[in-house]
C-alpha cells in the first residue's frame, strides 16, 4: 500500500491523528486521548483495481476481470480507495455500566489502502 | 449488511457467480469450477457511512464524525460501498511450480457490504 506523499493522486494512505476530545468522546474514553487512525484517499484507475498488495486482491482481481471486459453490471461499478489492512488498538474506556474496560478494539488503525 | 433485493439503491450485497472458465483460469484451478464471489453496489449517503455491521465501523465512524462536521479533507471524501466482511474458500490449484496445492484462499467471498 502506498503512503501519500503529495506527489501522486493514486490511492494511498494518509496520516491522520484523531483527538477523542475533538469528537466528544473524551468523557467515555479514558486512554489514549487520541490516536493515528489514518485514512485512504486517491484515484483508483482501472489498472490498479485489485492489484496485489491489497488484502481484497483475489476477490477484486476476479471482479476486475469482469469489469475490464465491460461485463454488465461491473462496467459502471466504481473501484474505491479503501482500507485493505486495519490494525487493532488497546483502549481503556467506560462501558454502559460505567465499568472500566481495557480492550483491544479491532479495525481502529488503517495500515494499508487499496482499490476495491 | 443488506442483501440487494432490487427495491433499494442503498449499499448492499449482490449475488454473483464467477466461472473460472469464463476468466481463463480453468487450466490452473482444479476445483471448484467456480464460486459465488458476490459483490457490493449501491449508494452511501452520509447518514449510513460508517454504520455498525461493518468491520470498518470504529474507524469509519470516527472518520464520519469529521466528515459530517465538514472537516477538511473529509468533506469531499466519498463514502464507498465496499466489502466489509469477506470469507475464505478452499481451492485446489497448480502453483507457480506446477505443484498441486490445496489452500484456503483468504478474502474470496463477499459476506457483507458496508459504507467505508
Amino acid at each position: 500500500g502506498l503512503e501519500c506523499d503529495g506527489k501522486v493522486n493514486i490511492c494511498c494512505k494518509k496520516q491522520f491523528f484523531v483527538s477523542f476530545k475533538d469528537i466528544g468522546w473524551n468523557d467515555w474514553i479514558i486512554a489514549p486521548s487520541g490516536y493515528h487512525a489514518n485514512y485512504c484517499e486517491g484515484e483508483c484507475p482501472s489498472h490498479i483495481a485489485g492489484t496485489s498488495g491489497s488484502s481484497l486482491s483475489f476477490h477484486s482481481t476476479v471482479i476486475n476481470h469482469y469489469r475490464m471486459r465491460g461485463h454488465s453490471p461491473f462496467a459502471n461499478l466504481k473501484s474505491c480507495c479503501v482500507p485493505t489492512k486495519l490494525r487493532p488498538m488497546s483502549m481503556l474506556y467506560y462501558d454502559d455500566g460505567q465499568n472500566i474496560i481495557k480492550k483491544d478494539i479491532q479495525n481502529m488503525i488503517v495500515e494499508e489502502c487499496g482499490c476495491s | 449488511g443488506l442483501e440487494c433485493d432490487g427495491k433499494v439503491n442503498i449499499c448492499c450485497k449482490k449475488q454473483f457467480f464467477v466461472s473460472f472458465k469464463d476468466i481463463g483460469w480453468n487450466d490452473w484451478i482444479i476445483a471448484p469450477s467456480g464460486y459465488h464471489a458476490n459483490y457490493c453496489e449501491g449508494e452511501c449517503p452520509s447518514h449510513i457511512a460508517g454504520t455498525s455491521g461493518s468491520s470498518l465501523s470504529f474507524h469509519s465512524t470516527v472518520i464520519n464524525h469529521y466528515r459530517m462536521r465538514g472537516h477538511s479533507p473529509f468533506a469531499n471524501l466519498k463514502s464507498c460501498c465496499v466489502p466489509t466482511k469477506l470469507r475464505p474458500m478452499s481451492m485446489l490449484y497448480y502453483d507457480d511450480g506446477q505443484n498441486i496445492i490445496k489452500k484456503d484462499i483468504q478474502n474470496m467471498i463477499v459476506e457483507e457490504c458496508g459504507c467505508s
Epitope: 496485489s52 | 480453468n26 507457480d96 496445492i101
Partner: antibody, heavy 123, light 108 residues
Framework: QVQLVQSGAEVKKPGASVKVSCKAS????????IHWVRQAPGQGLEWMGH????????NYAQKLQGRVTMTTDTSTSTAYMELRSLRSDDTAVYYC????????????????WGQGTLVTVSS | EIVLTQSPGTLSLSPGERATLSCRAS???????LAWYQQKPGQAPRLLIY???SRATGIPDRFSGSGSGTDFTLTISRLEPEDFAVYYC?????????FGGGTKVEIK
Amino acid sequence: QVQLVQSGAEVKKPGASVKVSCKASGYTFTGYHIHWVRQAPGQGLEWMGHISAYSGTTNYAQKLQGRVTMTTDTSTSTAYMELRSLRSDDTAVYYCARARDIAAAGLGAFDYWGQGTLVTVSS
Amino acid sequence: EIVLTQSPGTLSLSPGERATLSCRASQSVRSSYLAWYQQKPGQAPRLLIYGASSRATGIPDRFSGSGSGTDFTLTISRLEPEDFAVYYCQQYSNYPRTFGGGTKVEIK
C-alpha cells in the same frame, strides 16, 4: 507444452518506435498476465510492466510511462510491447514472460519466458 | 519500490563446492513472494525457486532457497558444470516488480 515465441531482432534509429510481439501457445492465454523485462548488454534485468491478457489492464514501470504501450490480441494469443522515442540506452534484449499475479494464492513468479528480442538503437 | 541487493557480485568456485548467494530487500517482502532465476549467456532467464523456498518444475534438489522478510538465500549444495551462470532474485510482493543486480557464479 507452454511456449512464448518472440519476433526477430530489430535495428532502429533514435526517435523511432519498435513493436515486439510475443506469441503464446500451450496454455489458456487469457488466464495469465504477460510481463515485459529488458536487459541492456552486460547488465541486469529490468521490469518494464505487464498486461492482463484477459482484461487488457496494464501496469507500467514509472520510468517508461508515456513511452511504452502493451497490448494483446486474444484471437491470436499474442502480446505486443511498443516502445516509442527510442534512445541509445534502450538498446537491450526484450523478454516477455507469463505470470499469474494473484497474491492471495501465492502466485506471481515468471514461470515461462520468451527467447528474447534484441533491439538495437543506433544512428 | 523494493530495492533488492545481491551479494557477492561474483562468486568464484570449483565444481563440487557449495555456493551461497544472498539477496537483501530494502523492505519486507510480503509472504515470501521472492523468486530466483538462473540465466546463461545468450539465454532467457529460467525460474529456479518461487515463494522463497519452493523449487520450480524440473529443478534439481541441489538448488534450495530460504529466508523471509528482508533476507533471502539461494544455496547450490554441490556445483555442477552447468550451474555456472548468473543468478537473479526478484520480488513479486509489490509493484513495480524488481530484480536484484545479479550474482555471477564462475569457475575458479
